[in-house]
Interface confidence: low
């Protein structure tokens, strides 16, 4: 009996394509699951087989490669739609096999509709531009392999619903869109429409991405701890609740991991035999600078706890900082009848 390595339904690859546009979908086996490529597999005598399950159906069926004008075809490890139809939505499986070896994976393909302003259920990639950073470009994505280099397509860029022409700081340059200087006002969805001829027909590729203007690395600083600080003393009596916020500002940094943590007497709170809870909240500015607050809480503080060292730490790609909170045991106010009277020598 032959072992078929069934990778199941690869939901990580939620492929979405626009209705009535060409789509080329590579078999994910060679991109994510196997260590060899299609050419190696093919030369080893392995065959790639495609089949699909229509939306809301359980029946696996072969793909009809004999449609008029070769609407669906396969070329090496690529499944082609020229163009897609709404009812092409379903789960597609590519299977690599010969008499002794078998490996397959399924993936969902969703054909979506768009309106005249390019709005659709499509999940959009996000491209981050640095604020006021000089010339930056975005490139029309995922158009490689649709037409040979000898074909010169026409490319039209839109911001939202509007064709980009005579914009102050945004200039279309073929497949690229150049931002001479990026401002918050440049946030939004940008669409390129690529039009190219093939075998006497004209095809359109629509690609939309979201531009988000973020803090510039020129302005980035190490984490800044706003709290605890030298101006606030946490003075508590035993039995009271101790609440210390650690509030840290992080400049936006591409791919930086921002971290905030507390230590108590130099140890992580989990390693201390006291009942500590820590709650975190995160907020972002318009340019994705981040403020993280971690509130350290001890419900019923003891006099021992009030002698401990509480230090807030923060780290980003720009550096690491730490700040200790000033924690004291409150000296109880004297009760006049006993303590004060004794102070005046009363008997």
């Amino acid at each position: 009996s032959e072992r078929c390595d069934d990778w199941g339904l690869d939901t990580m690859r939620q492929i979405q394509v626009f209705e009535d546009e060409p789509a080329r979908i590579k078999c994910p086996l060679f991109e994510h699951f196997l260590k060899f490529n299609y050419s190696t597999a093919h030369s080893a005598g392995l065959t790639l087989i495609w089949y699909w399950t229509r939306q809301d159906r359980d029946l696996e069926e072969p793909i009809n490669f004999r449609l008029p004008e070769n609407r669906i075809s396969k070329e090496k490890d690529v499944l082609w739609f020229r163009p897609t139809l709404l009812n092409d939505t379903g789960n597609y499986t590519c299977m690599l096999r010969n008499t002794t070896y078998c490996s397959k994976v399924a993936f969902p393909l969703e054909v979506v509709q768009k309106d005249s302003c390019f709005n659709s259920p499509m999940k959009l990639p996000v491209h981050k531009l640095y604020i006021e950073y000089g010339i930056q470009r975005i490139t029309c994505p995922n158009v490689d392999g649709y037409f040979p280099s000898s074909v010169k397509p026409t490319i039209t860029w839109y911001m939202g619903c509007y064709k980009i022409q005579n914009f102050n700081n945004v200039i279309p340059e073929g497949m690229n869109l150049s931002f001479l200087i990026a401002f918050i006002s440049n946030n939004g969805n940008y669409t390129c429409v690529v039009t190219y001829p093939e075998n006497g027909r004209t095809f359109h590729l629509t690609r939309t991405l979201t531009v988000k203007v973020v803090g510039s690395p020129k302005n980035a600083v190490p984490p800044v701890i706003h709290s605890p600080n030298d101006h606030v003393v946490y003075e508590k009596e035993p039995g009271e609740e101790l609440l210390i916020p650690c509030t840290v500002y992080f400049s936006f940094l591409m791919d930086s991991r921002n971290e905030v943590w507390w230590t108590i007497d130099g140890k992580k709170p989990d390693d201390i035999p006291i009942d500590v809870t820590i709650n975190e909240s995160i907020s972002h500015s318009r340019t994705e600078d981040e403020t993280r607050t971690q509130i350290l809480s001890i419900k019923k503080v003891t006099s021992e706890d009030l002698k401990r060292s509480y230090v807030c730490h923060a780290r980003s790609a720009k550096g690491e900082v730490a700040k200790a909170a000033t924690v004291k045991q409150k000296v109880p106010a004297p009760r006049y009848t006993v303590e004060l009277a004794c102070g005046f020598g009363a008997t």
Epitope: W7, G8, L29, A44, L46, Y101
Partner: antibody, heavy 119, light 108 residues
Framework: QVQLLQSGAEVKKPGSSVKVSCKAS????????IDWVRQAPGQGLEWMGG????????NSAQKFQGRVTITADKSTNTAYMELSSLRSEDTAVYYC????????????WGQGTMVTVSS | EIVLTQSPGTLSLSPGERATLSCRAS???????LAWFQQRPGQAPRLLIY???RRATGIPDRFSGSGSGTDFTLTISRLEPEDFAVYYC?????????FGGGTKVEIK
């Protein structure tokens, strides 16, 4: 570096079941197959079956079908092999091994779990 | 199932000598999915060669694999004291995955 750590030795009565665990640490667990191989004392290696944790897809050698259950818990990076209706000839060291990628070789092995079946 | 036959059963050699181990398959091994393992007493097997001839990470270049179809060979160019062990071939191209019976390389 990925390591596979197996549960300790077991002594079982004929007719009972044994469940051996294999915990992966230090690397990606889900996308690789974890296979089970056994070795009777003084004998060679025998493949029992395997599972790809990310999909829960298990398969086993015909010889063990109906007696072996291979599962995986993605949350703890642990694979399990349960063998039922034990007989004395099931006395062996049971190894888990990571299948480097689809139809690739067993590149990382657990330390082995000795299972003794005796009345 | 694919039956793998290893020969010889035992190979008696001295350190520094060349060892040639054979593995014959009852039918063609799919896509050359053939591996070699070394097993020392009391230890788990260790991958030496996969895909017939590709050395696994950290394996010294005195170990080499060759062959295709149904006939495969593991060669150890100069035996070191730590190389005396049992060697298994395995095909991992079709189910059930199968191992050869092993070749013991012992000190002469």
């Amino acid at each position: 570096q990925v390591q596979l750590l197996q549960s300790g030795a077991e002594v079982k009565k004929p007719g009972s079941s044994v469940k051996v665990s294999c915990k992966a640490s230090g690397g990606t667990f889900n996308i690789y197959a974890i296979d089970w191989v056994r070795q009777a004392p003084g004998q060679g290696l025998e493949w029992m079956g395997g599972i790809i944790p990310i999909f829960g897809t298990a398969n086993s050698a015909q010889k063990f079908q109906g007696r072996v259950t291979i599962t995986a818990d993605k949350s703890t990076n642990t694979a399990y092999m349960e063998l039922s209706s034990l007989r004395s000839e099931d006395t062996a060291v049971y190894y888990c091994a990571r299948n480097g990628a689809t139809s690739d070789a067993f590149d990382i092995w657990g330390q082995g779990t000795m299972v003794t079946v005796s009345s | 199932e694919i039956v793998l036959t290893q020969s010889p059963g035992t190979l008696s050699l001295s350190p520094g000598e060349r060892a040639t181990l054979s593995c014959r398959a009852s039918q063609s091994v799919s896509s050359n999915y053939l591996a070699w393992f070394q097993q020392r007493p009391g230890q788990a097997p260790r991958l030496l060669i996969y895909g017939v001839s590709r050395r696994a990470t950290g394996i010294p270049d005195r170990f080499s694999g060759s062959g295709s179809g149904t006939d495969f060979t593991l060669t150890i160019s100069r035996l070191e004291p730590e190389d005396f062990a049992v060697y298994y071939c395995q095909q991992y191209g079709s189910s059930p995955l199968t191992f050869g019976g092993g070749t013991k390389v012992e000190i002469k």
